[in-house]
Interface confidence: medium
């Protein structure tokens, strides 16, 4: 799979398509996340290009939901959150690629795939077991290192890309720096390129037109295409539904991801929902902003994402007039604003930015079959294959 950003649903969809539907990925173990049972009225979000895409996750190339899948070991790790309170992150993380859900997922959905095989989530329903992902250092570690960390809860299945999954040759690990600036334009690939995104669907039709073993059409035949990429801009999974205003399917039945922004942002993927432990989740990786990490100068704002050492995180309200803002917030025009809000593209490559209690700003990076973004701000691209190897 090209090392493109998995920031768009379309892209994610493509990735998903790259591998045969529900073809387990190497080391792809999905916990608890199974594709919806085939036959369920899953609103497969078909990308305008005809690809199916799940909601936000798909939109975000399903990679946003994951805290770094790389750090599945984070489970239980406590990190400071925007609220200043230490919070234990879910221990299970799912591999971002798994989040794509095409690969390995427990057969949560009997209809979708063989019972023995990973559930056959819709292409967008990729769930990847966190266990499969290599364990990485605890959240604190990656926070300090600025490395990515797996979602404590485990990668969430990306919203299923409804596009058919095509087998995707495992690509070599591509550690490409897609850091392209806060604008999120550096996502490497157009969001539209995500599977399910209008632009991508057309540009990246199902690989070889393959469809999952179970017919996605059968599962989603009555679903209108859902262009998750439309709802997944460079921001977090929940933040937006469309990445590049691709309007191929303006009236999509599916809803795009929502965003969490503002000081009180949930960081739930504003763009990307957090991964639940052990559950399949959209492919994405979370990257917490390292303590005291600064974003750089922003007119009218002092970006100190974390409270000074020894200073407990203050409530937004209490810090509004203070000199410092809670972790994940920066002073802007005299008030504390969440990094996610001030920098919609704080997380690159379609990563979803959100604030987590006691952790601060997190970037949930997009993940797709065989490829996902990593890094504190999803600035790097790595392939699933690489990780698996």
């Amino acid at each position: 799979v090209p090392a493109r950003e998995a920031g768009s649903a379309v892209e994610a969809e493509e990735l998903v398509k790259g591998r045969p539907a529900w073809e387990p990925r190497a080391n792809d173990t999905r916990e608890e996340a199974g594709p919806p049972a085939a036959g369920e009225d899953e609103a497969s979000w078909t990308a305008p290009g005809g690809e199916l895409a799940g909601p936000e996750e798909v939109l975000q190339a399903t990679g946003t939901a994951w805290l770094e899948a790389d750090n599945p070991g984070l489970g239980g790790v406590t990190s400071e959150a925007g609220s200043g309170d230490a919070q234990a992150l879910p221990a299970t993380l799912q591999a971002p690629h798994e989040v794509l859900g095409q690969s390995v997922m427990p057969p949560a959905i009997p209809e979708a795939t063989e019972a023995s095989g990973p559930p056959s989530p819709t292409p967008g329903d990729n769930l990847s077991p966190a266990s499969e992902l290599p364990k990485e250092s605890p959240l604190e570690v990656w926070l300090n290192l600025g490395g990515s960390t797996p979602d404590p809860q485990g990668p969430e299945p990306t919203y299923p890309f409804q596009g058919t999954l095509e087998p995707q040759p495992a690509s070599d690990i591509i550690d490409i720096d897609y850091f392209q600036g806060l604008d999120g334009e550096g996502r490497g690939a157009d969001l539209g390129s995500f599977p399910g995104s209008p632009g991508t669907s057309e540009n990246h039709p199902d690989t070889e037109g393959e469809t999952p073993s179970w017919s996605l059409l059968d599962l989603y035949d009555d679903f209108t295409p859902f262009d998750e990429s439309d709802f997944y801009p460079t921001t977090s999974f929940y933040d937006d539904l469309d990445e590049e205003e691709e309007e191929e399917e303006d009236d999509k039945d599916a809803v795009g991801g929502g965003d969490l922004e503002d000081e009180n942002e949930l960081l739930v993927p504003t763009g990307k929902p957090g991964l639940g432990p052990g559950t399949g989740q959209p492919n994405s990786r979370w990257h917490a902003v390292p303590p005291q990490h600064t974003l750089g100068s922003v007119p009218g704002s002092s970006i100190a994402l974390r409270p000074r050492p020894g200073e407990p995180g203050r409530d937004l309200a209490s810090s509004e007039n203070g000199t410092e803002c809670r972790s994940g917030f920066v002073r802007h025009n005299g008030s504390c604003r969440s990094v996610c809000d001030l920098f919609p593209s704080y997380c690159h490559n379609g990563g979803q930015c959100y604030l987590v209690e006691n952790i601060g700003a997190f970037c949930r990076c997009n993940t797709q079959d065989y490829i996902w973004h990593k890094g504190m701000r999803c600035e790097s691209i790595i392939t699933d294959f690489q990780v698996m190897c």
Epitope: P35, E57, A108, G124, P157, D250, P269, L275, G276
Partner: antibody
């Protein structure tokens, strides 16, 4: 501070139309998907529709598809929901919410009553 | 789409812990870790208190915690307080026509 303020609700007869508006402030409106979620009296929440930040993508619940149209004017930081062919079952408090799946901010809601 | 299943009501005494369940299926709750919980006071708008199964938004009391097991997600409120009396709604991402699925809501009464 993120604020969402809905307006436009009211009493309308079955088959009638209403246009709800949601004025947003406190965040970069165009960067976020927005949704409409409703709650019938004494009932749970029901997602109605969502629109991407750019307005290029829209999504609807089957129950309103073809009758409701969600739109937004990013220059005015305003979200809209045009409701046509209203039915009694559309009676509910309509909330404007930020994002599409994870609603971190909600408006106070506007009541829409469809009755003859 | 049928809503997620929540008990209509739950009650507890101050200081106690209560758990509200939210049961779905493999296509929503069990399939994704995108479960969120909203608190809603009578006549007020919902407020996000838990997302991604167990994450708490900034500013939300740590007395609120979320978890998930199989098809069921749970919201636990420890050290119950009078101000916790409200309706609680769960929601989950769903890979279906309805990407956002809500539960029917649970009324929590603090005795």
């Amino acid at each position: 501070e993120v604020q969402l303020l809905e307006s436009g609700g009211g009493l309308v007869q079955p088959g009638g139309s209403l246009r709800l508006s949601c004025a947003a402030s406190g965040f970069t409106f165009s960067s976020y998907a927005m949704s409409w979620v409703r709650q019938a009296p004494g009932k749970g929440l029901e997602w109605v529709s969502a629109i991407s930040g750019s307005g290029g993508s829209t999504y609807y619940a089957d129950s309103v598809k073809g009758r409701f149209t969600i739109s937004r004017d990013n220059s005015k930081n305003t979200l809209y929901l045009q409701m046509n062919s209203l039915r009694a079952e559309d009676t509910a408090v309509y909330y404007c919410a930020k994002k599409w799946n994870l609603f971190d901010y909600w408006g106070q809601g506007t009541l829409v009553t469809v009755s003859s | 789409q049928s809503a997620l299943t929540q008990p209509a009501s739950v009650s507890g005494s101050p200081g106690q812990s209560i758990t509200i369940s939210c049961t779905g299926t493999s296509t929503d709750v069990n399939g994704y870790n995108y479960v969120s919980w909203y608190q809603q006071y009578a006549g007020k708008a919902p407020k996000l208190i838990i997302f991604d199964v167990s994450k708490r938004p900034s500013g939300v009391s740590n007395r609120f915690s979320g978890s998930k097991s199989g098809d069921t997600a749970s919201l636990t409120i420890s050290g119950l307080q009078a101000e916790d009396e409200a309706d609680y709604h769960c929601s989950s991402y769903r890979r279906l026509r309805l990407p956002v699925l809500f539960g029917g809501g649970t009324k929590l009464t603090v005795l």
